[in-house]
């Protein structure tokens, strides 16, 4: 379960809130402190919905250790970091006669071909089907023979050369040359039943965060793939109303395992693509799960190639507190893959579940004999540990009361990682490098580059990590810069959003406060989007923007232009978010506090946060509201149904209402199984419906898309029924044929307009 992109980012690629923040001080937006003397316009709802103020991104794709591709005026340019110059790689006129709108492109690693994607049809969060054509960059022409079929589900180049693997009708095919026929790898694919090389619904959403279940070996010899069997998985069914002319609605059926239901099973195979032949079926060699997994239901949760002939697989028990990493070597004499028990690495949790959402991926050294991995240390903080494949124990190379977010690159001399160590701010992100020959030699590469403007970084490294792009996303306007790893020198500014900065000078923008409160001797962070000319002696209505799912973070240093920007700027509403128990990146003591107890502490902590905010003197405690989407909709509903008396009103969009309705992988990770022997009692007493009576004390707006494949409309339907049954008056809105994101242009505008009216009415605003 993830917050829809639109909620996190406003419109895709958009961000938020001007001005600089120094924690915990609030610096107001440039301009006069006198609100009456400020004639500048505010950031309006229309500005948000129409994306008037557009953040500029600088998207690049590294194609070597010193070159990347980027788009400019629809031309594809190649930038050479060595020489610091750009040249045209492909002119936008190249495909003028193509006859299709190109959705995406992908260059083969040897630079000889470009794969063109069109006829894009979205399926779920990551999955889609499309048509593909291949353009020969040497001959400057489209390849017309032996084309990839329409409605292809996934395509990927091999890591070197120009082999292609693709999935069509749930079966895998390989092309050795773009203009040669495909070799069929699997023959068992069947819609909604057997998936080869692609994920089913739950693996896509909750395990791999991808449609692809194919993994090329580094030199493109082997192709590893997973096969999912959903034969016994129950179907979720919902109506799709489609065009008005459709007399009978279509029924959508998706294999979707709810908590405690039958799960998909998984098998894993490797095929040698150098020995393919049209006259004989490909020989796929199975790698079976470890014995400790085969005793019960389990998941494949990570696949990482270590070398050309070594692969690591991570498996996870259905009760997600125990995982095993297998390291398997190709045995040339038998053509099999051997996974030695002596090389198995077990990862378990006694306080919760393994990993943040799943076990982290290993980062292997060049020889494949050792790897680095983020795991929980003795104190419950996630840090980098160094493993040798033949040894059980590992050596932590980082430590502290902060967490490593991700390993970004590994060279022979350094490991590069992102962490939230700097200034003890969990909501910040910076890039560090650690010397592999001396773990005490750690350098922060981003901390001091632009410390007021930039406190939240992500990074993109070139192929061998000689260069990197730093992407600063706040608290100031996003800034993209290019750097050399040789001396960590900044080479150039790629995008500084100066045009937007100039535009926003003429807007009364909110400011952002990031601070913490202490509860039971523990720091809990919050953020507040404060109206322009904020005056702490005045009373403001407050909207609590909540997510609060396990390992979530809503208090950060990211700049965003979103609905909250409008509410603060135009309606003078404080929009606050609070990271309570269950939230992430601050150690397992906080994160695992809600283990087996969803709907308890994370809900109570939002109520307590609102109480604390109302004590701050500038909050009108008669005008406190709460809203959230997805898990945030669940928490919103649980809060409003708590009878706390703190909140006047609230909005729940696409909420979970009962954990037995949500998917098995996500739900059971935190709740275990809904059986009497396990955790059925808490499943039953953590429902929104059981709190129906308390909704008489609040104003409630319930919203859901009818075609939500993720959090099913069923969940809101049951809330509605329970409220009606006890005579609660409430407001509701459905969005016909919208999924979990409610993201179509018209629905997006409608939902935010509707919610704005509701909040304004609740706060008695004109």
């Amino acid at each position: 379960m993830k917050t829809p992109w639109k909620v996190l980012l406003g419109l895709l690629g958009a961000a938020a809130l001007v001005t600089i923040i120094t924690v915990p001080v609030v610096l107001l937006n440039k301009g006069t402190d006198d609100a009456t003397a400020d004639s500048r316009k505010t950031y309006t709802l229309t500005d948000y919905l129409k994306n008037t103020y557009r953040l500029k991104l600088y998207s690049l794709r590294w194609i070597s250790d010193h070159e990347y591709l980027y788009k400019q005026e629809n031309n594809i340019l190649v930038f050479n970091a060595e020489y610091g110059n750009s040249s045209v790689f492909l002119e936008n006129s190249t495909f003028d006669e193509f006859g299709h709108s190109i959705n995406d492109y992908s260059i083969s690693p040897d630079g000889q071909f470009i794969l063109l994607e069109y006829n894009y049809v979205k399926q779920w969060r990551h999955s889609y089907t499309a048509s593909y054509d291949i353009y020969d960059l040497n001959k400057r022409q489209l390849i017309t023979e032996e084309r990839i079929p329409n409605n292809t589900q996934w395509v990927t180049w091999s890591p070197v050369g120009h082999k292609l693997a693709y999935v069509w009708n749930n079966d895998i095919y390989v092309k050795i040359e773009p203009n040669l026929p495909s070799y069929r790898i699997t023959w068992t694919g069947k819609e909604d039943i057997i998936y080869n090389g692609i994920t089913d619904w739950v693996y896509e959403e909750e395990v791999f965060s991808a449609y692809s279940a194919l993994w090329w070996s580094p030199n493109g010899t082997f192709l590893a793939y997973a096969q999912f069997n959903d034969t016994e998985v129950p179907l979720i069914e919902y109506s799709f109303y489609s065009d008005e002319s459709l007399q009978y609605p279509k029924t959508v059926r998706v294999p979707y395992p709810k908590a405690g239901a039958v799960n998909p099973t998984v098998k894993f195979f490797v095929v040698n693509t150098d020995s393919l032949s049209s006259v004989t079926n490909a020989t796929s060699i199975q790698i079976t799960a470890p014995a400790s997994m085969l005793i019960g239901d389990h998941y494949l949760c990570d696949v990482t190639w270590a070398t050309q002939e070594r692969i690591s697989l991570q498996w996870l028990r259905r009760i997600q507190n125990y995982s095993v990493m297998d390291i398997c070597d190709y045995d040339e004499s038998s053509g099999r893959w051997n996974c030695l028990v002596a090389r198995q690495h077990i990862e378990m949790s006694t306080t919760g579940w393994v990993g943040r959402f799943r076990p982290s991926e290993p980062h292997f050294t060049l020889d494949g004999n050792s790897f680095y991995k983020i795991i929980s240390n003795e104190e419950g903080y996630r840090h980098i540990c160094y493993f040798q494949i033949d040894k059980k124990d590992c050596t932590f190379i980082t430590k502290g009361t902060w967490e490593v977010i991700g390993i970004e690159a590994l060279t022979s001399d350094y490991l590069y990682y992102i962490s939230n160590e700097y200034k003890g701010m969990p909501g910040g992100r910076n890039l560090y490098k650690i010397q592999l020959s001396d773990y005490t030699k750690v350098t922060c590469l981003s901390c001091e580059l632009n410390p007021e403007r930039c406190q939240y970084y992500s990074v993109s490294f070139s192929k061998e990590a000689k260069y990197y792009q730093l992407r600063c996303s706040g608290p100031g306007l996003p800034l993209y810069t290019l750097h050399s790893s040789v001396n960590d020198k900044g080479l150039r500014v790629l995008e500084d959003n100066s045009a937007l900065d100039k535009m926003l000078q003429n807007v009364q923008m909110p400011s952002k406060k990031l601070d913490f409160i202490i509860l039971n001797e523990t720091k809990f962070w919050y953020q507040m989007i404060l109206p322009p000319h904020f005056d702490k002696s005045k009373k403001y209505p407050l909207l609590l923007d909540v997510y609060a799912g396990p390992c979530s973070q809503k208090a950060d240093t990211v700049f965003r232009l979103n609905w909250a920007t409008y509410l603060a700027s135009t309606e003078n509403i404080i929009v606050a978010s609070f990271d309570g128990r269950g939230s992430g990146y601050q150690g397992d003591k906080i994160m695992h506090a809600i283990n087996r107890r969803l709907g308890t502490f994370e809900v109570e902590d939002q109520i307590e946060a609102a109480r604390q905010f109302s004590k701050m003197g500038f909050v009108d405690n008669k005008r406190i509201a709460i809203w959230g989407w997805s898990y945030g909709g669940y928490v919103t509903s649980m809060v409003l149904g708590s009878g706390s008396g703190v909140f006047k009103c609230g909005i729940a969009v696409a909420p979970v209402s009962r954990w037995e309705y949500y998917d098995s992988v996500y739900t059971e990770r935190y709740m275990g199984l809904p059986t009497p022997e396990d955790n059925l009692d808490h499943y039953r007493n953590s429902t929104v419906m059981s709190r129906a009576e308390n909704f008489k004390q609040v104003e409630y707006l319930l919203i859901h898309g009818t075609a939500d494949d993720n959090v099913h409309f069923q969940q809101s339907a049951q809330i509605s029924k329970a409220l009606v049954d006890v005579g609660v008056d409430f407001q509701a809105m459905w969005y016909t044929d919208e999924d979990h994101g409610i993201a179509s242009s018209t629905a997006h505008q409608h939902i935010y307009t509707h919610m704005s009216h509701f909040i304004k009415q609740c706060f008695s605003l004109p």
Partner: antibody
Framework: EVQLQQSGAELMKPGASVKISCKAT????????IEWVKQRPGHGLEWIGE????????HYNERFKGKATFTADTSSKTVYMQLSSLTSEDSAVYYC??????????WGQGTLVTVSA | DIPMTQTTSSLSASLGDRVTISCRAS??????LNWYQQKPDGTVKLLIY???RLHSGVPSRFSGSGSGTDYSLTISNLEQEDIATYFC?????????FGGGTKLEIK
Amino acid sequence: EVQLQQSGAELMKPGASVKISCKATGYTFSSYWIEWVKQRPGHGLEWIGEILPGIGTTHYNERFKGKATFTADTSSKTVYMQLSSLTSEDSAVYYCVRKNYDWFAYWGQGTLVTVSA
Amino acid sequence: DIPMTQTTSSLSASLGDRVTISCRASQDISNYLNWYQQKPDGTVKLLIYYTSRLHSGVPSRFSGSGSGTDYSLTISNLEQEDIATYFCQQGNTLPYTFGGGTKLEIK
């Protein structure tokens, strides 16, 4: 550079067996099929069969089942073909070939087998 | 089995000539047709695979075409080193089968 080095010429008696070797270098041995092809003067080229070293999968032309047997030794990167119950019909040049997908990409120099009383 | 027929068993041509060698399959082989060159010393080389794709290192004067059952190999500008026997082979179905060969000689 891909190379297939075949063993030398053999003079055999009728009824005997012969084992021809083909040593592969310059590529990942277990990843490619090795084909065996027979050439008799005036008879053109005849496909005997193939072996995928490592896995050891074999396919034989029906006409050579019982006549030819393929084996592979991955440690020495060598493929062997044994021909049994030799007759004058088996006198020929035998080629080992590395197959790339559906074409015979790299040919050994050939081994002449002569069957004579 | 799929018999492959090279109707011309030998062919005489002059240096610089354009030479075409044909090959017919007894049934559709879906373009899985390869051409090989065998020199008088017995050395065999792949020239063309999948009807028309030139194998690496093969001079561009060699080209292939065809579909269904009928295929041909063309040498656009005959050179001395091209004197050899040329075989076609189908790769569509097991057992693989070869044509009888076309021996190319200089006039």
